[in-house]
């Protein structure tokens, strides 16, 4: 039997060690031998669980043997060198490589030594964000559409707003066996508030440093939202003249402005110039409701402005005059 | 080309000791474990113990408890193998054989054979 | 001590057959063990290491197989020359035990 004190000797090996599909790995694995110890390596063996036989050995005599020569090689075993270091590297890392793998090193005296070390094949996914262009609906409906492709294992996607909203996310297969494609739709009632506001798609994963930020510029479409200002309820006669304004939030843009009244054409004291309606002085008290009629691509939209010109001293007031 | 060459057979009576020797040439004498196995006529293989030559570390079969002394002669290359309180069951072919893990080249054996 | 159970302990076969050993270890050895044979009046040659890997030198003919505890020596075509007694040892732990042999015979 080994001689006391000869338990000190251990098979150093990271419990987890992570590689890329498609890429090369290497699982590291060390004897270390204490100062006073003395240990003697004919053997180095790996072996994955779960699977018979062993995949890779380094010999003494014999040296290297695989059991697919083309994905395996021994980093440092060499002929005539002591044997310390099992370190072993694969090739085109497969899915089906993941697992439990086995690093032995045959010792005199002390037996046997061995330490598991879990290889972790990852995928780096790709991901993109996009707005899913919506009209006013009335009802949830996705606004924005984040995809990590090809991740192995699936990214966590999450979604940050300050507009509330509900994720919705599913998983299908990747292009290549093993990975996953993740896709989260952000949802919400869309209103012409939400429009060009921001919401960051969030995606984490193993193989990143840190988590991938997506902004999505949302994009509501709606027909106009129309007011008039400009009037402040205090126009007089013999004031000078003033301008209205027809204030339309839409998207897409306007593409027209029309300004009428309740009565059919405008008068003639009020000349159209667009989004702005000129009214010029008066001599004579009026009471007239303007109309202004917004139009774009979903549709028109007006509003309404009953304008009084009253009787009163001009110097003392802002309002409708002739120079 | 390797080469393990023991010492010639030995008639021994009970209770005796015998000094085998095995002596080795083609390698690095210090590089390889040397290991002693024994085999009873007609039966299966039996491991005795190894020696390192190097720092001279051993490993023993408890089974032959203490009466086995593993050396080497680095001078010569040459391993032994001592058994001492001889019984007639130790009659047997004794094989010193270079340790790669399993047991890569074998001596040609040496006949012991324990009778009164 | 780790047992190594061989069968069968002997068997006869013609030159061509295919030929099976086994060898069956009490606990987990891993891939730990050697193929030897022995042919009379010789000591014993290796032929196999780490459960599968052949000698250099050792014809093709010979293959191994198995972990944990269980292991098989083949030989896929008989010749005359493989008139011998064949031993599986394990390696994973002090004291290292062999199988109690299989003798061959060519019918």
């Known amino acids: 039997w080994p001689p006391p004190g000869t338990g000190d000797v251990v098979v150093q090996a990271p419990t987890q060690v992570p590689g890329f599909l498609g890429d090369s790995v290497t699982l590291p694995c060390y004897l270390q031998v204490p100062n006073m110890e003395v240990t003697h390596v004919s053997q180095l063996t790996w072996a994955r669980h779960g699977e018979s036989g062993s995949m890779a050995v380094f010999h003494q005599t014999q040296g290297p043997s695989y059991s697919e020569s083309k994905r395996l090689e021994f980093v440092a075993a060499r002929l005539g060198a002591e044997l310390r270091n099992a370190s072993l590297r694969m090739f085109g890392l497969r899915v089906e490589d993941e697992g439990n793998y086995t690093c032995l090193f045959v010792t005199f005296p002390q037996g046997s030594r061995s330490v598991d070390i879990w290889l972790r094949v990852l995928a780096k996914p790709q991901n993109t964000a996009e707005v899913q262009k919506v009209q006013l609906t009335g009802e949830p409906v996705p606004m924005a559409r984040c995809v990590s492709t090809g991740g192995r294992p699936p990214a966590q996607i999450t979604w940050h707003s300050d507009l509330g909203g509900m994720p919705n996310t599913s998983q299908v297969p990747g292009f290549l066996s093993g990975t996953v494609t993740v896709t989260s739709l952000w949802i919400l009632v869309p209103s012409s508030q939400v429009d060009g506001k921001n919401v960051t798609c969030k995606v984490e994963h193993e193989s990143f440093e840190k988590p991938q930020l997506l902004t999505v510029n949302l994009t509501v479409y709606y027909p106009p939202e129309v007011s008039i200002s400009g009037y402040d309820n205090n126009w007089y006669l013999g004031q000078n003249e003033a301008t209205l304004t027809c204030d339309a939030r839409s998207n897409p843009e306007p593409t027209g402005y029309n300004w009428s009244t309740t009565m059919g054409p405008l008068p003639p004291f009020a000349v159209a110039q667009g989004a702005q309606l000129l009214i010029r002085p008066v001599d004579k008290p009026i009471n007239t409701t303007l109309i202004c009629n917004v139009t774009n691509a979903l549709g028109a939209r007006q509003a309404e402005l009953t304008v009084q010109v009253k009787e009163g001293p001009p110097s003392e007031h802002s309002g409708i005059s002739r120079n | 080309e390797v080469q393990l060459v023991q010492s010639g057979s030995e008639l021994k009576k009970p209770g005796a000791s015998v000094k085998i020797s095995c002596k080795t040439s083609?390698?690095?004498?210090?590089?390889?474990?040397m290991h002693w196995v024994r085999q009873p006529h007609g039966k299966g293989l039996e491991w005795i113990g190894g020696i390192h030559p190097n720092q001279g570390e051993t490993s023993y079969n408890q089974r032959f408890k203490g009466r086995v002394t593993l050396t080497v002669d680095k001078s010569t290359s040459t391993a032994y193998m001592e058994l001492s309180s001889l019984r007639s069951e130790d009659t047997a072919v004794y094989y010193c054989?270079?340790?790669?893990?399993?047991?890569?080249?074998w001596g040609q054996g040496t006949l012991v054979t324990v009778s009164s | 001590d780790i047992q190594m159970t061989q069968s069968p302990s002997a068997m006869s076969a013609s030159v061509g057959d295919r030929v099976t050993i086994t060898c069956k270890a009490s606990?987990?050895?891993?891939?730990?063990v050697a193929w030897y044979q022995q042919k009379p009046g010789q000591p014993p040659k290796a032929l196999i290491y780490?459960?599968?890997y052949r000698y250099s030198g050792v014809p093709d003919r010979f293959s191994g197989s198995g972990s944990g505890t269980d292991f098989t020596l083949t030989i896929s075509s008989l010749q005359a020359e493989d008139l011998a007694e064949y031993f599986c040892?394990?390696?994973?732990?002090?004291?290292?035990?062999f199988g109690q042999g299989t003798k061959l015979e060519i019918k």
């Open positions: 040892q394990q390696y994973e732990s002090y004291p290292y035990t």
């Open positions: 083609g390698y690095t004498f210090t590089e390889y474990t």
């Open positions: 054989a270079r340790w790669t893990g399993d047991f890569d080249y």
């Open positions: 780490s459960a599968s």
């Open positions: 606990q987990n050895v891993g891939t730990n």
